[in-house]
C-alpha cells in the first residue's frame, strides 16, 4: 500500500506527445507503474511506463503518433490515470480529466543560427518544433544571452510578444564570446507553461576595427 500525498502533472506539446510527472511522498517498493491515456472522442488509447527521475517522482512520455501529427483538438478531454501493479491487479493511484489545450508546453525551439554578426550586434533566427496549426500566430518567446563571467540565471530576459522567430541583439561587446537561448509559449491555456530552453547557440562578435594613426 502507498500512503502520503501524490501529485500528477501532465503537459501536451500541441501535436502528438503528452509528458507526465507523478510524485508520491509515500514509499513505493519495486512497483511497476504506468500512465494510461483514454481520450473521450478518439479511437486510440495509449500507455507509457513511468520511470524514476528522483527518489519520489517518476516520468513518462505518451507518444500519440508521428511527431508532427495532430492527435488532439481543443474539444478533446483525455482521462489520464496512474496505474501501479499490486499483485496481480492494477491499482489507480491518480486520475485527472486532462484538457490538452489548457495544459500546453511546447518543444524547445530548434535550428538556432546566426544570420548576421557584427562588432556590437548579432541577428539570430530559430524555428519552432511540433507546434499545432491551432495557434496560428498566437505565440510568444523569451530569449536570454549569456555574457562572459555571468550565469544563465543572471541573464536578463528579452520578451517577444508575438510569433517572431528572430532577434537582433544590440549593444554587444566586440570580439566577445556569447551564448544565446530562446523558449516559446502559446497564449492559449490556463495552465500552459514555457517550453524548455533551446540548446544554447554560441557565437562571437567581430573584433573592433583597429584605429588609424593620425
Amino acid at each position: 500500500a502507498v500512503n502520503g500525498t501524490s501529485q500528477f502533472t501532465c503537459f501536451y506539446n500541441s501535436r502528438a506527445n503528452i509528458s507526465c510527472v507523478w510524485s508520491q511522498d509515500g514509499a513505493l517498493q519495486d512497483t511497476s507503474c504506468q500512465v494510461h491515456a483514454w481520450p473521450d472522442r478518439r479511437r486510440w488509447n495509449q500507455t507509457c511506463e513511468l520511470l524514476p527521475v528522483s527518489q519520489a517522482s517518476w516520468a513518462c512520455n505518451l507518444i500519440l503518433g508521428a511527431p508532427d501529427s495532430q492527435k488532439l483538438t481543443t474539444v478533446d478531454i483525455v482521462t489520464l490515470r496512474v496505474l501501479c501493479r499490486e499483485g496481480v491487479r492494477w491499482r489507480v493511484m491518480a486520475i485527472q480529466d486532462f484538457k490538452p489545450f489548457e495544459n500546453l508546453r511546447l518543444m524547445a525551439p530548434i535550428s538556432l543560427q546566426v544570420v548576421h554578426v557584427e562588432t556590437h550586434r548579432c541577428n539570430i533566427s530559430w524555428e519552432i518544433s511540433q507546434a499545432s496549426h491551432y495557434f496560428e500566430r498566437h505565440l510568444e518567446f523569451e530569449a536570454r544571452t549569456l555574457s562572459p563571467g555571468h550565469t544563465w540565471e543572471e541573464a536578463p530576459l528579452l520578451t517577444l510578444k508575438q510569433k517572431q522567430e528572430w532577434i537582433c541583439l544590440e549593444t554587444l561587446t566586440p570580439d566577445t564570446q556569447y551564448e544565446f537561448q530562446v523558449r516559446v509559449k502559446p497564449l492559449q491555456g490556463e495552465f500552459t507553461t514555457w517550453s524548455p530552453w533551446s540548446q544554447p547557440l554560441a557565437f562571437r562578435t567581430k573584433p573592433a576595427a583597429l584605429g588609424k594613426d593620425t
Epitope: 472522442r41 479511437r43 501529427s69 495532430q70 474539444v75
Partner: antibody, heavy 116, light 107 residues
Framework: QVQLVQSGAEVKKPGASVKVSCKAS????????ISWVRQAPGQGLEWMGD????????NYNEKLQGRVTMTVDTSTSTAYMELRSLRSDDTAVYYC?????????WGQGTLVTVSS | DIQMTQSPSSLSASVGDRVTITCQAS??????LNWYQQKPGKTLKLLIY???GLHTGVPSRFSGSGSGTDFTFTISSLQPEDIATYYC?????????FGQGTKLEIK
C-alpha cells in the same frame, strides 16, 4: 452489438416543443459522447450539439439560439433532445449518433414535422 | 464556423469505375475529417474516420486521403450497392460541420 433506437415520428404546431429520445445498447453508455444531427427534407446535415453521458457536459450549436436542451438518463441508457419554440424550418429528420473518431453509430432517425 | 465544400454535388459513373469526391475546409482541420454514406431513406454510415481510417466492416475499395484543407474520398471500383449520397464532416472544432453531399448514380 451497438444500437441506437430513437422514438417515433412527431407532428407539432409552430411554437410548441418536441422531445426526441435515443436509447443506447451494446456499449458503455457513459463512455462516449452522443451527438444530435438533423436533416431537413432534401437538405444537408446540421450538427445540433452533443452530450457526454458520464458527466452531463454539453456543447450546443449557437445557431439554435438556446432553443435546444440535451439530457441523459444513465439508468436507462437514454439520451434526449428537446427543441423549443418550433418553427416550420425545424421540420427535419433528427438523428442521434455516437461519437468515437467520427459518428460511428447512428439512430434510425425521427421525423419531426412542424405544421399549423 | 468551418465551412466544408464538397464537389461535385452529383456524379454518374459505371460499375467498376474509380470514383473520386473532394472536400475542402475553409481553414486547416489537420486530419479531423470523416466520410459518411447515406442510402435513400436510410440512416448514415461511417466509412472513413480521421482522413484515412477505414471503419469496422467497411469494404477496402473505400479510401480517403488529404490533410489541412484538401481531402479526397475514393471508391476504387464502383459497385451497384454504392449508389448513395456521400458526406464529409469535420470534427476539428465545434460546431461540427458537414459538406453539402455528393449524390452518386450509376450510368
Amino acid at each position: 452489438q451497438v444500437q441506437l433506437v430513437q422514438s417515433g415520428a412527431e407532428v407539432k404546431k409552430p411554437g410548441a416543443s418536441v422531445k426526441v429520445s435515443c436509447k443506447a445498447s451494446g456499449y458503455t453508455f457513459t463512455s462516449h459522447w452522443i451527438s444530435w444531427v438533423r436533416q431537413a427534407p432534401g437538405q444537408g446535415l446540421e450538427w445540433m450539439g452533443d452530450i457526454y453521458p458520464g458527466s452531463g457536459n454539453t456543447n450546443y450549436n449557437e445557431k439554435l439560439q438556446g432553443r435546444v436542451t440535451m439530457t441523459v438518463d444513465t439508468s436507462t441508457s437514454t439520451a434526449y433532445m428537446e427543441l423549443r419554440s418550433l418553427r416550420s424550418d425545424d421540420t427535419a429528420v433528427y438523428y442521434c449518433a455516437r461519437e468515437r473518431g467520427g459518428f460511428d453509430y447512428w439512430g434510425q432517425g425521427t421525423l419531426v414535422t412542424v405544421s399549423s | 464556423d468551418i465551412q466544408m465544400t464538397q464537389s461535385p454535388s452529383s456524379l454518374s459513373a459505371s460499375v467498376g469505375d474509380r470514383v473520386t469526391i473532394t472536400c475542402q475546409a475553409s481553414q486547416d482541420i489537420s486530419n479531423f475529417l470523416n466520410w459518411y454514406q447515406q442510402k435513400p431513406g436510410k440512416t448514415l454510415k461511417l466509412l472513413i474516420y480521421y482522413t484515412s481510417g477505414l471503419h469496422t466492416g467497411v469494404p477496402s475499395r473505400f479510401s480517403g486521403s488529404g490533410s489541412g484543407t484538401d481531402f479526397t474520398f475514393t471508391i476504387s471500383s464502383l459497385q451497384p450497392e454504392d449508389i448513395a449520397t456521400y458526406y464529409c464532416q469535420q470534427d476539428n472544432n465545434h460546431p461540427y460541420t458537414f459538406g453539402q453531399g455528393t449524390k452518386l448514380e450509376i450510368k
